[in-house]
């Protein structure tokens, strides 16, 4: 139709100019379209340069839209992580503050002479919570062994207790149970509580990290062509008012985001495991009850030691021999009053319940994030036609879009009519992130069963380091030796230093 050949390019000029491009590129009227590489080659208002500019722009716009969606999800996960992390650290800090405030009055020098040992225990618990590769059971065993040695000396100032005698005491300790049931109870409960807390917070961190890394995955050239065709070819072909057909848009974005959709199964598994582990936040072995009450177990232990002092001393003498009396030493330490115990069960503050219910709701909301991404971007960013009718842009002209909508994921794109996807070449960054999701899900499942797991770095290259049982020194066989280990980067932030008298303490 000769009349159509001289159609004005005014509308295209407006749109093109609004994008910040030079208006001098736009022809006054339609020209023949043999030069077009992406759009159908009918009469057109687009030069080669315009097509290239618009293709680059459509690519950038899709990447921006993708990043925006990811940023919203990342921000939600980061906020959750910060809230839970603050709460858990607050519980532990609160417990330590309570200990520092009450133990001097309750236990006198039995505490003040050993303040450093208690301070270190809290430091190690903090590190353990943050994901450091510490063995909690060994850390606790070593704490009790050292504390016993020091308290035994304090309770018997009238005795000469050389190192070899104290070493003998240490070897007897496990059988003597000098601190009663407190160490065993604390070990069992703390391991479960801390591993639940730290794996949950780390799960949030891994999820956020995966979103961040996947958002940086570039869209391929085939996707760029398809998005240009979807978004701007209608303008070039003189039907700027035609909006993309919904199914057409979905097929383009399902092809473009095929690899991202493959995250779906493991993403769901991770979020399910995170929701599940929040069950471990309640009850007598729950996070709130245990982490906030470490000091009460410690008080119970010191009380038990004082109550059992005479029996303990008799058993130690039986196993290690009679120690020499210190001629200059004072008489035996008189029994101190029992340290008053705060109730072990902390009344729930309500904060954690609120945090958990919000988190569960938000995690459920984003469970289908990856597979709903094409639909979300199409409906929110692509100005779709409201109906799948014959007036929408189908990639060639105004008209009905006939092909069926593809399934989700890479394998389902084999016959995608809009994007040529090589299903034999999955994106390696995304495969690595799938692996990170699997690893974290396994950690959460172990944590749910109360098992301590060696947290390895969720490193960029997807590789991790195994842990062997090699020994660095001759103390490995000792019950209380600490496993030589390197602590990992903290998940969030280091605690500010505390100052102690003249000594300036830093972290």
């Amino acid at each position: 139709d000769p009349a159509s050949k001289s159609r004005s390019c005014g509308e295209v000029r407006q749109i093109y100019g609004a994008k910040g491009f030079s208006l001098s590129d736009v022809p006054q009227a339609e020209i023949s379209g043999e030069h077009l590489r992406i759009c159908p080659q009918g009469y057109t208002c687009c030069t080669s340069e315009m097509e290239e500019n618009l293709a680059n722009r459509s690519h950038a716009e899709l990447e921006t839209a993708l990043r925006d969606s990811s940023r919203v999800l990342q921000a939600m996960l980061a906020t959750q992580l910060r809230s839970f992390d603050d709460h858990f650290q607050h519980l532990l800090n609160d417990s330590e503050r309570t200990l520092q405030a009450t133990f001097p009055g309750a236990f006198g020098e039995l505490y003040t002479q050993n303040a450093r040992a208690f301070r270190d225990l809290y430091s190690e618990l903090r590190l353990y919570y943050r994901g450091a590769n510490l063995h909690l059971e060994e850390t606790l065993a070593e704490f009790w062994a050292r504390l016993l040695e020091r308290l035994f000396k304090q309770l018997h100032p009238q005795l000469l207790l050389p190192d070899d005698y104290l070493d003998c005491l240490g070897k007897q300790a496990e059988a003597l149970r000098p601190f009663g049931e407190a160490p065993r109870e604390l070990r069992l409960r703390a391991t479960r509580a801390f591993v639940a807390a730290r794996s949950f917070v780390q799960g949030l961190g891994v999820a956020s990290d995966v979103v961040r890394k996947v958002a940086q995955v570039p869209l391929g050239p085939e996707c760029s062509r398809a998005v240009m065709k979807l978004v701007y070819c209608a303008h070039c072909l003189g039907v700027p008012g035609a909006r993309p057909c919904p199914d057409y848009c979905r097929n383009v974005l399902k092809g473009c985001l095929a690899n991202q959709a493959d995250l779906d199964a493991e993403w769901r598994n991770l979020l399910d495991s995170m929701v599940l582990i929040t069950d471990k936040f309640w009850g007598t072995s729950g996070v709130e009850s245990v982490i906030g009450s470490v000091h009460t177990w410690l008080a119970e232990a010191i009380n038990a030691l004082q109550d059992n002092r005479d029996t303990l001393t008799a058993k130690v003498i039986q196993g290690c021999g009679n120690p020499k009396v210190n001629p200059q030493g004072p008489g035996p330490e008189e029994k101190r009053r029992r340290g008053k115990l705060a109730p072990r069960e902390r009344p729930p503050s309500g904060t954690l319940e609120k945090l958990v219910s919000e988190a569960k709701a938000q995690l459920r909301d984003v469970q289908d994030f990856w597979i709903s991404l094409p639909g979300t971007l199409c409906s929110e960013k692509m100005a779709l036609s409201t109906a799948s009718d014959d007036r929408c842009w189908n990639g060639m002209a105004r008209g009905r879009y006939l092909p069926e909508v593809m399934g989700d994921g890479l394998a389902n794109q084999i016959n995608n009519p809009e994007v040529e996807v090589d299903i034999t070449k999955p994106d390696m960054t995304i495969r690595q992130q799938i692996m990170q999701l699997k690893i974290m899900t396994n950690r959460l499942r172990s944590a749910y069963n109360g098992n301590d797991v060696d947290f390895q770095d969720a490193s960029d290259d997807g590789s991790g380091s195994g842990s062997g049982d090699g020994c660095l020194d001759d103390l490995c066989s000792r019950k209380v030796s600490r496993k030589s280990s390197s602590s990992r980067t903290p998940l969030t932030h280091a605690l500010p230093g505390l100052s102690e008298q003249e000594g300036q303490k830093t972290s």
């Epitope: 450093r116 903090r126 050292r146 020091r150 020194d473 030589s484 003249e502 000594g503």
Partner: antibody
């Protein structure tokens, strides 16, 4: 057998910095604090500070806070002390020492002589 | 900070003689936090007596320690040539940890 092996003597110019090392062996490095002590003819023995290799917690003697920086490398079981802005007052023998159980210096390195001279 | 004052700064004793070195502490400390170290020239200090009165491994029984509060002492019941050295007291009660200035013990 517990051993603390310190780096060799250092001759440094005023204003410069020096980093001395203390390699631990024969025990679990992360299990015990490492302390640093200065010995000069004028001032006898002076405690500089301590570091907990497990947690990285450090306590300094306020007097040495601006002078010394303590660090550890757990992978090599080595403690380090960096001394900065050196003057002739910093010429001394520096010892690392390991405590036994929060209570005394049970093991000492052989010492590192630092001489500050132009 | 806690100041440790040792007396005498220098002394000489004949073999077989009884020797006492004292360490005065500027504020009262627990006896478990007072330690003594021996140092011979060109070598590192060695733990000698810990917790006021416990002898470190390998220390001859002629050495003993006593005291409480602010006043502590190290005693050699019968001086021998190998005991010639400098002895330092040290407190582990509060930061900063502090040492005495040392007592140099020589053999006559």
């Amino acid at each position: 057998e517990v051993q603390l092996q310190q780096s060799g003597p250092e001759l440094v110019k005023p204003g410069a910095s020096v980093k001395i090392s203390c390699k631990a062996s024969g025990y679990s490095f992360t299990g015990y604090y490492i302390h640093w002590v200065k010995q000069s003819p004028e001032k006898s023995l002076e405690w500089i500070g301590e570091i907990n290799p497990s947690t990285g917690d450090i306590t300094y003697n306020q007097k040495f806070k601006a002078k010394a920086t303590l660090t550890v490398d757990k992978s090599s079981s080595t403690a380090y002390m960096q001394l900065k802005s050196l003057t002739s007052d910093d010429s001394a023998v520096y010892y690392c020492a390991r405590e036994r159980n929060y209570d005394r210096f049970a093991y000492w390195g052989q010492g590192t002589l630092v001489t500050v001279s132009s | 900070s806690i100041v440790m004052t040792q007396t005498p700064a220098l002394m000489a004793a004949s073999p077989g003689e009884k020797v006492t070195i004292t360490c005065s502490v500027s504020s009262s400390i627990s006896s478990s936090n007072l330690h003594w170290y021996q140092q011979k020239s060109e070598t590192s200090p060695k733990p000698w007596i810990y917790g006021t009165s416990n002898l470190a491994s390998g220390v001859p029984v002629r050495f003993s320690g006593s005291g409480s509060g602010t006043s502590y002492s190290l005693t050699i019941s019968s001086m021998e040539a190998e005991d010639a050295a400098t002895y330092y007291c040290q407190q582990w009660s509060s930061y900063p940890l502090t040492f005495g200035a040392g007592t140099k013990l020589e053999i006559k």
